[in-house]
């Protein structure tokens, strides 16, 4: 019961987290114009990963998409990539975890398979959450760097006569949404991994099976092997991996640096 609750809660928390990551990625307010210690402008600037917007005090808002790909800063491209990787991994994780849920019965899927799927989705959620947190943190770092650079030359004078308002940008709502969502996805992933341990069938290495025969013959079966109860007429023996650990080809690969180019 506790395992089902942990798995279910992990799924719901991850679902909320991934929805948050998607929302943060789509939001326009990744960076907003800093209004502190600044002239009161009748224009408010804010920027997202995909477009920049200007809201006038008249209420009119105009947004322009970044129609260039090569002209964009490498850091922005990296953040985009991290967020997309996070969303993709999270979406796959959600799909896998649906089938892994203990409360959902699919055919005659055994607990070991569900345990493996739960672990897979858990790891996917963890990586997804880390991608989102990394993406948001990279963007935040970029903002902090630019903020202090623009503060250094807050007003650029032309012969000391004409002043130019230097627009400084600070953290937008999307950053906080991203951090929280990434954290939730991470927590959800950890919960799925914990649930996986409880789902895995705990079997002893050697099981003695006694038969009430006339003689004292006792048949034993090596605990390392188990008759398959999979789909179809497969009667071959499969190796049982204790604790639901996975084979090499099941291990989740992390995105390489080349994903961000």
């Amino acid at each position: 019961m506790a395992v089902t609750a942990c798995q279910g809660l992990g799924f719901v928390v991850s679902l909320i987290g991934i929805a948050g990551i998607i929302a943060a990625t789509c939001m326009d307010q990744w960076s907003t114009q800093d209004l502190y210690n600044n002239p009161v402008t009748a224009v408010f600037n804010y920027q997202g990963l995909w477009r920049s917007c200007v809201r006038e005090s008249s209420g009119f808002t105009e947004c322009r998409g970044y129609f260039t790909l090569l002209g964009l800063p490498a850091m922005l491209q990296a953040v985009r990539a991290l967020m997309i990787v996070g969303i993709v991994l999270g979406a796959i994780g959600l799909l896998v975890s649906i089938f892994a849920l203990k409360c959902i019965r699919i055919g005659s899927m055994e607990d070991s398979a569900k345990a493996n799927m739960t672990l897979t989705s858990g790891i996917m959620f963890i990586v997804s959450g880390l991608c989102a947190i990394a993406g948001v943190s990279v963007f935040a770092n970029m903002l902090v760097t630019n903020f202090w650079m623009s503060t250094a030359n807050m007003y650029t004078g032309m012969g000391g006569m004409v002043q130019t308002v230097q627009t400084r940008y600070t953290f937008g709502a999307a950053l906080f949404v991203g951090w929280v969502a990434g954290g939730l996805t991470l927590i959800g992933g950890v919960m799925m991994c914990i649930a996986c341990r409880g789902l895995a069938p705990e079997e002893t290495n050697y099981k003695a099976v006694s038969y009430h025969a006339s003689g004292h013959s006792v048949a034993y079966k090596p605990g390392g092997f188990k008759a398959s109860t999979g789909f179809g007429s497969n009667t071959k023996n499969k190796k049982i991996y204790d604790g639901g650990a996975r084979t090499e080809d099941e291990v989740q690969s992390y995105p390489s640096k080349h994903d961000y180019v």
């Epitope: 009748a42 600037n45 005090s57 008249s58 209420g59 002043q163």
Partner: antibody, heavy 118, light 113 residues
């Protein structure tokens, strides 16, 4: 068509109060930023106050801050300017205007005259 | 506060003539976010409220004749009337619409010779 009609102006003694009204019609008043602008007897234009959409922000000219209050009644499509502690330099023709693209005042009323004199 | 300086204070012209008036701001009115200049031009005829001519320094308001053209960027702006007509005789004001307070220039009075 768009119409802005100001009222409430008149002669008032220094230190006195006055409430100006601006009845709007012909446009979506509740989703428009509105401003008060005054024109001095010397014909100088002076922006007085602005109220943005949804009561979010109000902005005032420094010399009227704390004395004037801009407000709106979206149900009745009316903009107000409550003026108190009036001074002789507040004497002017007061216009209410709608802010449009570029924060420009795209529609103006005919104005209401305010005279502060003892 | 941003100081708007208009020149000349008055202009005497003949009908059909090309007229240029200047407006300078003490601070740049260019917004980096959309690369637009928040400068507005108004026309005021005697006994009437001001009328919007040009916003964003160069965008003509609907219904405004094509002979009115706004130009400039940053701190220096110009209003040009390609061929003055009798109905254009008025006072022209420029306004900063970028930073509060939204200051106006003293105006340029257009008079007929």
């Amino acid at each position: 068509q768009v119409m802005l009609v100001e009222s409430g102006g008149g002669l008032v003694k220094p230190g006195g109060s006055l409430k100006l009204s601006c009845a709007a019609s012909g446009f979506a008043f509740s989703s428009s930023a509105m401003s008060w602008i005054r024109q001095t007897p010397e014909k100088r234009l002076e922006w007085v106050a602005t109220m943005t959409v949804g009561y979010i922000y109000t902005y005032y000219l420094d010399t009227v801050k704390g004395r004037f209050i801009i407000s709106r009644d979206n149900a009745n499509n009316t903009l107000y300017l409550q003026m108190s502690s009036l001074r002789s330099e507040d004497s002017a023709m007061y216009y209410c205007a709608r802010q449009g693209y570029g924060n420009a005042m795209d529609y103006w009323g005919q104005g209401t005259s305010v005279t502060v004199s003892s | 506060d941003i100081v708007m300086t208009q020149s000349p204070s008055s202009l005497t012209v003949t009908a059909g003539e090309k007229v240029t008036m200047s407006c300078k701001s003490s601070q740049s009115l260019l917004n980096s976010g959309n690369q637009k200049n928040y400068l507005t031009w108004y026309q005021q005829k005697p006994g009437q409220p001001p009328k919007l001519l040009i916003y964003w320094a160069s965008t003509r308001e609907s219904g405004v004749p094509y002979r009115f053209t706004g130009s400039g960027s940053g701190t220096d702006f110009t209003l040009t009337i390609s061929s003055v007509e009798a109905e254009d005789l008025a006072v022209y004001y420029c306004q900063n619409n970028y930073i509060y307070p939204l200051t106006f220039g003293a105006g340029t009075k257009l008079e007929l010779k």
